[in-house]
């Protein structure tokens, strides 16, 4: 759970209770067991800017 009163994470990131901050969902490729990765599965990635 994200701490009460904190701003939601931006697209492409998810709240980490372990690290007490928003973390990049992209890092779940290398570290899929990170606590925040469960929150990434439901959230769409940040859009590519080509």
């Amino acid at each position: 759970e994200q701490a009460p009163g904190t701003a939601p994470c931006s697209r492409g990131s998810s709240w980490s209770a372990d690290l007490d901050k928003c973390m990049d969902c992209a890092s779940c490729r290398a570290r899929p067991h990170s606590d925040f990765c469960a929150g990434c599965a439901a959230a769409p990635p940040a859009p590519f800017r080509l």
Partner: antibody, heavy 119, light 111 residues
Framework: EVKLQQSGGGLVQPGGSMKLSCVAS????????MNWVRQSPEQGLEWIAE??????????HYAESVKGRFTISRDDSKNSVYLQMNNLRPEDTGIYYC??????????WGQGTTLTVSS | DTVLTQSPASLVVSLGQRATISCRAS??????????IHWYQQKPGQPPKFLIK???NRDSGVPARFSGSGSGTDFTLNIHPVEEDDTAIYYC?????????FGAGTKLELQ
């Protein structure tokens, strides 16, 4: 404020040894992969070693150029990472940086320490 | 190993103009969702400073003048408008695999 404070370095003869240290503060050290990156005019920025987490028994990875000669280690109780360098060669000369990454990018770097391998 | 080729090696730009730096990977470093390319700025006597992650996402505190784009094998760092403080060497780095490698750097100078 995140800080990576390095120590060690200096002049060493070919075949000699040197140990570098890096003490971290301002972030949850035990969750981060710790790395050493060196820089020289010849090789540019060159990643040389990484140590991961206790939960995986501290796996390590090395660049081919240093494999078998360099050893990376960490002490989470001291928020510290080390690089033991043996059988040093002139081509190991450069600026050595410790750097942390959660998984992908090196978001914080030490100030750098210079190693010169010369007779 | 994935090789990153940066171009140009050096670049001279007038104040207020656009600087464009290219980074080409020897293989794709993108999934369908993310690109595993990151950008750094280094000034003389200092360590590299992290600027942009996953091809296009600025680190906190990095001015909007810096932007990154690209996917697959071709990536670009744009700086516009260029300011005096931007004189530095810029490096790309991939995190697709071990070893993570860096480009050779692009030196940006002001005219």
């Amino acid at each position: 404020e995140v800080k990576l404070q390095q120590s060690g370095g200096g002049l060493v003869q070919p075949g000699g040894s040197m140990k570098l240290s890096c003490v971290a503060s301002g972030f949850t050290f035990s969750y981060y992969w710790m790395n050493w990156v060196r820089q020289s005019p010849e090789q540019g920025l060159e990643w040389i070693a990484e140590i991961r987490l206790q939960s995986n028994d501290y796996p390590t990875h090395y660049a081919e150029s240093v494999k078998g000669r360099f050893t990376i280690s960490r002490d989470d109780s001291k928020n510290s990472v080390y690089l033991q360098m043996n059988n040093l060669r002139p081509e190991d000369t450069g600026i050595y940086y410790c750097a942390c990454r959660y998984a992908d990018y090196f978001d914080h770097w030490g100030q750098g320490t210079t190693l010169t391998v010369s007779s | 190993d994935t090789v990153l080729t940066q171009s140009p090696a050096s670049l001279v730009v007038s104040l207020g103009q656009r600087a464009t730096i290219s980074c080409r990977a020897s293989q794709s470093v993108s999934t369908s969702d993310y690109s595993y390319i990151h950008w750094y700025q280094q000034k003389p006597g200092q360590p590299p400073k992290f600027l942009i992650k996953y091809a296009s996402n600025r680190d906190s505190g990095v001015p909007a003048r810096f932007s990154g784009s690209g996917s697959g094998t071709d990536f670009t760092l744009n700086i516009h408008p260029v300011e005096e403080d931007d004189t530095a060497i810029y490096y790309c780095q991939h995190s697709w695999e071990i070893p993570p490698t860096f480009g050779a750097g692009t030196k940006l100078e002001l005219q």
